[in-house]
Interface confidence: low
C-alpha cells in the first residue's frame, strides 16, 4: 500500500498592498511533513515584511524626476523562499517588481538552475500600471509536476544594462522513492554468499530500505538507502526485492531470480549426420545449461557388437558447435554413441544412447606373403597369398586385383587382373621372355580397392631354361625382394 | 499439527532465576526465528526476545526490559525453545508464552503459532 | 520505541452489532500491523497480519485497514465467540511492540 503524508496549506499574501499575486497550487503544496518524531523540512515558506530591502541584486537607476528626486533602488520583492510539494499536483509562483514608468520595454524572464527558460509555455506577465511606476507580476505555473521540475527558480530583468536578479524559489518536488539501482538477477553457486544492491532516492529524504526474499522481509531494521544485501549462501533458487520508504510511502522493486548453478541436464536429440567406413559425424541438442555456461562436452563410444571386450572410447570437445566428428573407428562396425556435458558444477549425466554404423571401406591392408614362380610346362607364371586380417578388410572381400608389369630391353608392359574371392592363389601367361615380371595383389571389397602389397619380381629366361625357384615377398627388415633363379 | 508446549512456571522470590522451556512440534523448529511474548495479569502482552533461524546462527535479540537479565536458547534436537531468567523482578510476574515467527519470515515478525503459556510469579 | 495506541480500552456491544477497533502507531509503520484476539485465560490467536490480510481459519466477518499510522479491525455481525481482548502489534523493526488491549464485552 502506498502511504500518502498529509497535505496542508498556509497560504498568505505574496504582495502586499495593492498587487495582487499570492501562491496557488492546484492542491495546495507540502507546508508542513506530519510526522512523530517531529521531524519539519528545513525550508518553509518565509513571506517577507513589506519594505524589508532586497538582498539580491539590485539596480540604482541613475535617471532623476522633474523635482530632481532620486528614485529608489529597483528590486524584485520578496516572495515564498521554498515551496514543497508532491509529484503530479501544479504549482503557481510569482515574481513582482514596482519599475517607474520612465522605463520602458521592461521584459522579466525565467532561469532555473542557471538556464534561461526561452518560451516557457506557463510563463506569464501581467502589467499593472500606476501614476508614477508599473507594477510587474510574472507567474510560473506547472500544471503537473514531476522530479525533473525539482530546481532553483529565478526571474531577471534588464534594466539600463543593469541586471535584476530575484531571491531563488526553490521547488522540491516530493514522491514515493525512485529506484536509482536494483538488485541484478544472478546465478550463484550453492551454499556461496553474494551480494545485492537496492539504492532508492526521495524527496523526501530519507529513504529506508528493507530486502525481501520469497515475499518475506529479510532485514528486520530498516537500511538507510543504499544498501547492500550480503546473502550468506542459498540451497535453493530464491527472489529477491527491496523495498523502499518514505513519507510518501513506499515502491517496490522488481523481482530477481537468484538461480543455483547445478549439473546441466544431459544432451538430447543426438543424430548422426553423415557416416563412412572409419568415422561418424554426431550432432546433438544441449539440455539445460544449470544456470553456468557449458565448458566442453565428451563424447562416449562404444562397440555395440556383444562379442566385444565393452570397452569405451572417449573423446572430448568443445561445447560449441554441437558437432563432432568421431574418427579412427572400425569399418562395417556397430557403434553405441553418447554424449555429455559439463559445466563449472561438473558433468551432466550421458544423453539416451543411439546406435550407429560405420560404412563399407576399401581394406586397410594387402595380401600377406605374396609369392610368385615360373611354370615353364605350361608357360604361366603362379601367384599365391594369404588374405589380410578380417578386421583389416574393411568389409566383405568381392576378390582382389593383381598388377604384373613385364620388362625388357626397352619394353614395359603393365597388365590387371580381377580375381574372385575364393581361394588365394592366380596363375597369369607369361607375356614376355627374358624379361622381369613384377606382380602386385591388393584385396577389394565393395568399398573400393585395397592397398597394393610389395612387389615380388622373378625373371622370366628364354625358353630352354631347367630349372626355377619362387620368388615371394621378403620377410619383414628386407628392404627389396630377393629374386631366386 | 503445530503446537508450542510451556513449561517451568512458578513461583521464586525477587532476585532468583527460573528457566522455561517450550516444547515445539509439527513443524521444522530449526527453519523459524521463535519468540517469547509475556503478559502480566490484566494487562497487555509484551515482546521479550526473540531467537534466529538456523540459518541466521539462532542469535538472539531482547528487549530493553529483560536484556542482561534473560537468555533465549534452543536444543535443535530436542526442538526445545529455552528462555533462563535471572535477578527476577516482582513487575517479571505474569503469564510467559513462546510463539512462532511464520514460516521463512526473517522481519521484526507476527507471531502465527502460540503456546498455552505459563505463569511465573515473582514474590517474597 | 514505536509506541502502539489502542482505542478504545474497552467496549461493550451485542451479538449481530458492527463494532470497530483503531490503533495508531507513533510514527510510519507502512502496512507491518498484525491484530491478535486473545480469550480470557486462553493465549493469543493470530487474525490479520499485513494489516488487511485474514490469517488461515479466520471468518471473513472480521477485516483489517489502514496503513501509515492509523489502522482498524472492523468485526461485522458480532457472535458470541468474538467476544475477548484485541491486541495490535506492529513488526516495522524491532522490538516489535503491542498496543494496549481492547476489551470486547457482550452489553
Known amino acids: 500500500a502506498i502511504t500518502e503524508a498529509r497535505e496542508e496549506a498556509k497560504p498568505y499574501p505574496l504582495f502586499p498592498g495593492p498587487f495582487p499575486g499570492s501562491l496557488q497550487t492546484d492542491h495546495t503544496p507540502l507546508l508542513s511533513l506530519p510526522h512523530a518524531s517531529g521531524y519539519q523540512p528545513a525550508l518553509m515558506f518565509s513571506p517577507t515584511q513589506p519594505g524589508r530591502p532586497h538582498t539580491g541584486n539590485v539596480a540604482i537607476p541613475q535617471v532623476t524626476s522633474v523635482e530632481s528626486k532620486p528614485l529608489p533602488p529597483l528590486a524584485f520583492k520578496h516572495t515564498v523562499g521554498h515551496i514543497i510539494l508532491s509529484e503530479h499536483k501544479g504549482v503557481k509562483f510569482n515574481c513582482s517588481i514596482s519599475v517607474p514608468n520612465i522605463y520602458q520595454d521592461t521584459t522579466i524572464s525565467w532561469w532555473k538552475d542557471g538556464k534561461e527558460l526561452l518560451g516557457a509555455h506557463h510563463a506569464i506577465t501581467q502589467f499593472y500600471p500606476d501614476d508614477e511606476v508599473t507594477a510587474i507580476i510574472a507567474s510560473f505555473s506547472i500544471t503537473s509536476v514531476q522530479r525533473s521540475d525539482n530546481g532553483s527558480y529565478i526571474c531577471k530583468m534588464k534594466i539600463n544594462n543593469e541586471e535584476i536578479v530575484s531571491d531563488p524559489i526553490y521547488i522540491e518536488v516530493q514522491g514515493l522513492p525512485h529506484f536509482t539501482k536494483q538488485p541484478e538477477s544472478m546465478n550463484v553457486t550453492r551454499n556461496t554468499a553474494f551480494n545485492l544492491t537496492c539504492q532508492a532516492v526521495g524527496p523526501p529524504e530519507p529513504v529506508n530500505i528493507f530486502w525481501v526474499q520469497n515475499s518475506s522481509r529479510v532485514n528486520e531494521q530498516p537500511e538507510k538507502s543504499p544498501s547492500v544485501l550480503t546473502v550468506p549462501g542459498l540451497t535453493e533458487m530464491a527472489v529477491f526485492s527491496c523495498e523502499a520508504h518514505n513519507d510518501k510511502g513506499l515502491t517496490v522493486s522488481k523481482g530477481v531470480q537468484i538461480n543455483i548453478k547445478a549439473i546441466p541436464s544431459p544432451p538430447t536429440e543426438v543424430s548422426i549426420r553423415n557416416s563412412t567406413a572409419h568415422s561418424i559425424l554426431i550432432s546433438w541438442v544441449p539440455g539445460f545449461d544449470g544456470y553456468s555456461p557449458f565448458r566442453n562436452c565428451s563424447i562416449q563410444v562404444k562397440e555395440a557388437d556383444p562379442l566385444s571386450n565393452g570397452s569405451v572410447m572417449i573423446f572430448n570437445t568443445s561445447a560449441l558447435p554441437h558437432l563432432y566428428q568421431i574418427k579412427q573407428l572400425q569399418a562395417l562396425a556397430n557403434y553405441s554413441i553418447g554424449v555429455s556435458c559439463m559445466n563449472e558444477i561438473g558433468w551432466s549425466a550421458v544423453s539416451p544412447w543411439i546406435l550407429a554404423s560405420t560404412t563399407e571401406g576399401a581394406p586397410s591392408v594387402a595380401p600377406l606373403n605374396v609369392t610368385v614362380f615360373l611354370n615353364e610346362s605350361s608357360d604361366n607364371v603362379d601367384i599365391r597369398w594369404m588374405k589380410p586380417p578380417t578386421k583389416q578388410q574393411d568389409g566383405e572381400l568381392v576378390g582382389y586385383r593383381i598388377s604384373h608389369v613385364w620388362q625388357s630391353a626397352g619394353i614395359s608392359k603393365e597388365l590387371l587382373e580381377e580375381v574372385g574371392q575364393n581361394g588365394s592363389r592366380a596363375r597369369i601367361s607369361v607375356q614376355v621372355h627374358n624379361a622381369t615380371c613384377t606382380v602386385r595383389i591388393a584385396a577389394v571389397t565393395r568399398g573400393g580397392v585395397g592397398p597394393f602389397s610389395d612387389p615380388v619380381k622373378i625373371f622370366i629366361p628364354a625358353h630352354g631354361w631347367v630349372d626355377y625357384a619362387p620368388s615371394s615377398t621378403p620377410a619383414p627388415g628386407n628392404a627389396d625382394p630377393v629374386l631366386i633363379i | 499439527e503445530v503446537k508450542l508446549v510451556e513449561s517451568g512456571g512458578g513461583l521464586v522470590q525477587p532476585g532468583g532465576s527460573l528457566s522455561l522451556s517450550c516444547a515445539a512440534s509439527?513443524?521444522?523448529?530449526?527453519?523459524?526465528?521463535m519468540t517469547w511474548v509475556r503478559q502480566p495479569p490484566g494487562k497487555a502482552l509484551e515482546w521479550l526476545g526473540f531467537?534466529?533461524?538456523?540459518?541466521?546462527?539462532?542469535?538472539?535479540e531482547y528487549s530493553a526490559s529483560v536484556k542482561g537479565r534473560f537468555t533465549i536458547s534452543r536444543d535443535s534436537s530436542q526442538s526445545i525453545l529455552y528462555l533462563q531468567m535471572n535477578a527476577l523482578r516482582a513487575e517479571d510476574s505474569g503469564t510467559y508464552y513462546c510463539?512462532?515467527?511464520?514460516?521463512?519470515?526473517?522481519?521484526?515478525?507476527?507471531?502465527?503459532?502460540w503456546g498455552t503459556g505459563t505463569t511465573v510469579t515473582v514474590s517474597s | 520505541d514505536i509506541q502502539m495506541t489502542q482505542s478504545p480500552a474497552s467496549l461493550s456491544a451485542s451479538v449481530g452489532e458492527t463494532v470497530t477497533i483503531t490503533c495508531r502507531a507513533s510514527?510510519?509503520?507502512?502496512?507491518?500491523l498484525a491484530w491478535y484476539q486473545q480469550k480470557q485465560g486462553k493465549s493469543p490467536q493470530l487474525l490479520v497480519y499485513?494489516?488487511?490480510t485474514l490469517a488461515e481459519g479466520v471468518p471473513s466477518r472480521f477485516s483489517g485497514s489502514g496503513s501509515g499510522t492509523q489502522f482498524s479491525l472492523k468485526i461485522n455481525s458480532l457472535q458470541p465467540a468474538d467476544f475477548g481482548s484485541y491486541y495490535c502489534?506492529?513488526?516495522?523493526?524491532?522490538?516489535?511492540?503491542f498496543g494496549g488491549g481492547t476489551k470486547l464485552e457482550i452489553k
Open positions: 510514527e510510519n509503520i507502512y502496512s507491518y
Open positions: 531467537s534466529r533461524n538456523k540459518a541466521n546462527g539462532y542469535t538472539t
Open positions: 510463539a512462532r515467527f511464520p514460516p521463512h519470515y526473517y522481519a521484526g515478525g507476527y507471531f502465527d503459532v
Open positions: 499485513n494489516a488487511k
Open positions: 509439527g513443524f521444522t523448529f530449526t527453519d523459524n526465528y
Open positions: 502489534q506492529h513488526y516495522y523493526r524491532t522490538p516489535p511492540t
